[in-house]
Amino acid sequence: KETAFVEVVLFESSPSGDYTTYTTGLTGRFSRAGATLSAEGEIVQMHPLGLCNNNDEEDLYEYGWVGVVKLEQPELDPKPCLTVLGKAKRAVQRGATAVIFDVSENPEAIDQLNQGSEDPLKRPVVYVKGADAIKLMNIVNKQKVARARIQHRPPRQPTEYFDM
């Protein structure tokens, strides 16, 4: 299970005329459910239940985007409509170039994502937890536009990280 290096860039408008960008670095793990590839795109926050409805044609968003899913405690969703792997597949079907799961509340999901699948997804499926997950969700919950860049090597130049 390789380390996934994730850079998240948050965009904010400023009266001066250009955009202020805040870059945060965090690490996760590439799961066996997907490919160990670099990917990047706009972050789209997806509620686990939002992945349940099945009208895939209407729900295709064709630009490369990175789905971020915060998994809930298993007790809160004892009979999920889809497995964690099923949720990843559904996001990729809808156009996601990568999926990042926050598994802090549901660590069992790590094993589910790492069970050797005979047909792994062709896009990366990354999981984050602990302090890295908190950093990621703090940005995502701001409801501003953010982009994620996932790499399987550390970023070449040192990034200036802002504490979000």
Partner: antibody, heavy 118, light 110 residues
Framework: QVQLKESGPGLVQPTQTLSLTCTVS????????VSWVRQPPGKGLEWIAA???????YYNSGLKSRLSISRDTSKSQVFLKMNSLQTEDTAMYFC????????????WGQGVMVTVSS | DIVLTQSPALAVSLGQRATISCKTN??????????MHWYQQKRGQQPKLLIY???NLASGIPARFSGRGSGTDFTLTIDPVATDDTATYYC?????????FGAGTKLELK
């Protein structure tokens, strides 16, 4: 400061190929998407093609068979080739940058007027 | 392709409110975001981004401009209108490829 500048021929013969260049400064092509958008005289805006930071290419399906978009990151340039030009391709051609979303154009060049005529 | 419909022209008195509408033939929302944007184009100039994702003010744009709407119905409001606002205003969707624009609404001062 973000800047985009288009260059190319002002006049093209019908059936010929149009080659346009967009030179950008103030941002990197590896963190932005650049699109080409055109505007016939007195008319509205039409998106033509885009190349993303990850080098994904997107084309207007109605024009796709005639188009090619590429880039040279070392020179900060994006290129558009459009073949089999007709008089209805006469338009102002803009390049536009999208740093926030792929085809949301937060910066624009001044445009280059292309006339297709014999 | 998603079709965007705008009324062609609007005349407003200086200092009054201008409301420009845009309707789409398909929903442009995706997971809580609304992929509708607004541009201003003055005669002989390139377009300029005003509003993105339905209601976010672009950098350097005065707060007189605001956007709202979701689904298929959207408005751009300019309040109060200034002399400098004479221009054509375009809505654009980026929910589906290809990104498409409305035909534009020409704003004139009475």
């Amino acid at each position: 400061q973000v800047q985009l500048k288009e260059s190319g021929p002002g006049l093209v013969q019908p059936t010929q190929t149009l080659s346009l260049t967009c030179t950008v400064s103030g941002f990197s092509l590896t963190s932005s998407t650049v699109s080409w958008v055109r505007q016939p005289p007195g008319k509205g805006l039409e998106w033509i093609a885009a190349i993303s930071s990850a080098e994904n290419t997107y084309y207007n399906s109605g024009l796709k068979s005639r188009l090619s978009i590429s880039r040279d990151t070392s020179k900060s340039q994006v290129f558009l080739k459009m073949n089999s030009l007709q008089t209805e391709d006469t338009a102002m051609y803009f390049c536009a940058g999208g740093r926030i979303l792929e085809t949301l154009f937060d910066s624009w060049g001044q445009g280059v007027m292309v006339t297709v005529s014999s | 392709d998603i079709v965007l419909t705008q009324s062609p022209a609007l005349a407003v008195s200086l200092g009054q409110r201008a409301t420009i509408s845009c309707k789409t033939n398909q929903n442009v929302d995706f997971y809580g975001k609304t992929y509708m944007h607004w541009y201003q184009q003055k005669r002989g100039q390139q377009p300029k981004l005003l509003i993105y994702l339905a209601s976010n003010l672009a950098s350097g744009i005065p707060a007189r401009f605001s956007g709202r709407g979701s689904g298929t119905d959207f408005t751009l409001t300019i309040d109060p209108v200034a002399t400098d606002d004479t221009a054509t205003y375009y809505c654009q969707q980026t929910r589906s490829l290809p990104p498409t624009f409305g035909a534009g609404t020409k704003l004139e001062l009475k």
